[in-house]
Interface confidence: low
């Protein structure tokens, strides 16, 4: 998995009127990072693992440029035509990406009431834009605007990409970040479910990187995914990722019933509790 | 209407720097956005992308090549250049440049053909 | 750099044929994947841009799909003037390669 800074910028209008404020959150190898609340931008990290990736520092630097990229934004918002009246919102997501090859991928996308309309490679300064009347028309009205001064163009295109892999730089040499392999905690826990029958769920928490397998297994195989419901991956705020995958069992067979675990090359299984003990945690190195 | 013609010395001999011209009609090189390549074709070959340079004066070169390239602009002529130095019987191409506006070159000049021998 | 590999090197087919020619990079370039028509002795020309986007004045009887790492140029009724040699293009990252192409003739 590439490193990744994620820039997720909104302002509103309301009947063709920009509002003041904005929300700018800010995603750190898929982990949320910073917060900007809407009517005073103040970047606050998001749990102690943002807090540690730069250590006491105050966040001055990444309020201004998070409060500048938000009045940018408005500007823009301001210059599309024909705004209908009622609430209406433009999203600028912003990814810069550094692989393992240390090659770089960066890219723009703008998004009028959560429907996207205008996405730009920053490294090779490609526009691209879907085929509906709609998103060509939004996507001119955003372009001719940012074409209007060649300070504006400078921000929107040559900076923006060496900003965000600079940031990132940054952010990675805290060391923090580079933590690759932090293996799961696994939790199997059971519930009834109804008569005869048990729900057993399998947890998995606190690991990274966010790729996992995570199944349940009957006899040693695998059920069918039909039979098997699975929770998103979801950061927890610590940096790390939790999952779970839940299944329902005939209660007495819990012993036939195993979860399987695979992360960054390793593997466990951890079996049903049976009786009454609700939780049996199992964490490998 | 959109116009680019290559203009360049025909025949040089080996260790020479070719020095070619792009000039192009019909849209400006200062349109945010906007950006022109130079592409070359030996006979009876494929095409391969050489540099560019973009309406804020980035340039981008081929890695293959970069250390032998020079890629510059004259905004207000509507002119594009580049230069190739130590020339050898490789180079031999027809050399094209192209208008790269979102992501994919549109236009395509005429082309220009060299011939490097001794 | 991404490699673009074409497939056939050469496809000799009848008029009115329904033809397809074959893109792959070496890696996955989502849809950023232009598609070049070059006849004898002229310049190259602008067939299909982004995998499947349509070029206003190219007949619509060439099409494109795929994206990621495999792509498709399609002729539905070959035509005389088709015949020329078909270069696909990685628009994705620099440098920007193109295929070693597949030429085109009539049997």
């Known amino acids: 998995e590439p490193h990744s800074l994620r820039y997720n910028l909104t302002v509103l209008s309301w009947d063709g009127s920009v509002q003041s404020g904005f929300l700018t959150e800010v995603h750190l190898d898929g982990q949320p990072f910073l917060r900007c609340d809407r009517q005073k931008c103040r970047a606050k990290p998001q749990g102690q693992w943002a807090e540690d990736v730069l250590g006491n520092k105050t966040w001055d630097r990444e309020t201004r440029d998070l409060t500048g990229n938000g009045k940018d934004l408005r500007m823009t918002l301001a210059h599309i035509k024909d705004q209908k009246e009622g609430l209406h919102s433009l999203q600028e997501i912003r990814v810069c990406e550094i692989h393992e090859d240390n090659s770089t991928r960066s890219s723009q996308h703008f998004y009028y009431d959560g429907e996207l309309f205008l996405s730009q490679n920053l490294e090779t300064k490609e526009w691209t834009m879907p085929q509906s009347s709609r998103a060509q028309t939004l996507a001119m009205n955003v372009r001719n605007f940012l074409k209007e001064d060649a300070m504006k163009t400078k921000t929107h295109y040559h900076a923006m990409h060496a900003d965000c892999l600079q940031e990132l730089r940054r952010y990675l040499k805290s060391g923090v970040v580079l933590r690759r392999t932090v293996p799961p905690m696994v939790n199997v826990t059971r519930s009834e479910a109804s008569e005869g029958n048990i729900t057993v769920t399998c947890r998995a928490s606190g690991f990274y990187p966010w790729n996992i397998t995570l199944s349940w297994r009957q006899d040693g195989v695998s059920l069918s995914h039909d039979t098997q419901q699975w929770g998103d991956v979801l950061p927890d705020g610590n940096g790390t990722y939790q999952t779970w995958v839940a299944t329902r069992i005939c209660q007495g067979e819990e012993q036939r019933f195993t979860c399987y675990m695979e992360h960054s090359g390793n593997h466990s299984t951890h079996p049903v509790p049976s009786g009454k003990v609700l939780v049996l945690q199992s964490h490998w190195q | 209407q959109v116009t680019l013609k290559e203009s360049g010395p025909g025949i040089l001999k080996p260790s020479q720097t070719l020095s070619l011209t792009c000039s192009f009609s019909g849209f400006s090189l200062s349109t945010s956005g906007m950006g022109v390549g130079w592409i070359r074709q030996p006979s009876g070959k494929g095409l391969e992308w050489l540099a560019h340079?973009?309406?804020?004066?980035?340039?981008y070169y081929n890695p293959s090549l970069k250390s032998q390239l020079t890629i510059s602009k004259d905004t207000s002529r509507n002119q594009v250049f580049l230069k190739i130095t130590s020339v050898d019987t490789a180079d031999t191409a027809t050399y094209y440049c192209?208008?790269?506006?979102?992501?994919?070159?549109?236009?395509w000049g005429q082309g220009t053909t060299l011939t490097v021998s001794s | 750099d991404i490699v673009m590999t074409q497939s056939p090197a050469t496809l000799s087919v009848t008029l009115g044929d329904r033809v397809s020619l074959s893109c792959r990079a070496s890696?996955?370039?989502?849809?950023?994947l232009h598609w070049y028509q070059q006849k004898s002795h002229e310049s190259p020309r602008l067939l299909i841009k982004y995998a499947s986007q349509s070029i206003s004045g190219i007949p619509s009887r060439f099409s494109g799909s795929g994206s990621g790492s495999d792509f498709t140029l399609s002729i539905n009724s070959v035509e005389p003037e088709d015949v020329g040699v078909y270069y696909c293009q990685n628009g994705h990252s620099f440098p920007f390669t193109f295929g070693s192409g597949t030429k085109l003739e009539i049997k």
């Open positions: 890696q996955s370039i989502s849809d950023y």
């Open positions: 340079i973009w309406w804020d004066d980035d340039r």
């Open positions: 192209a208008r790269r506006l979102n992501g994919y070159f549109d236009y």
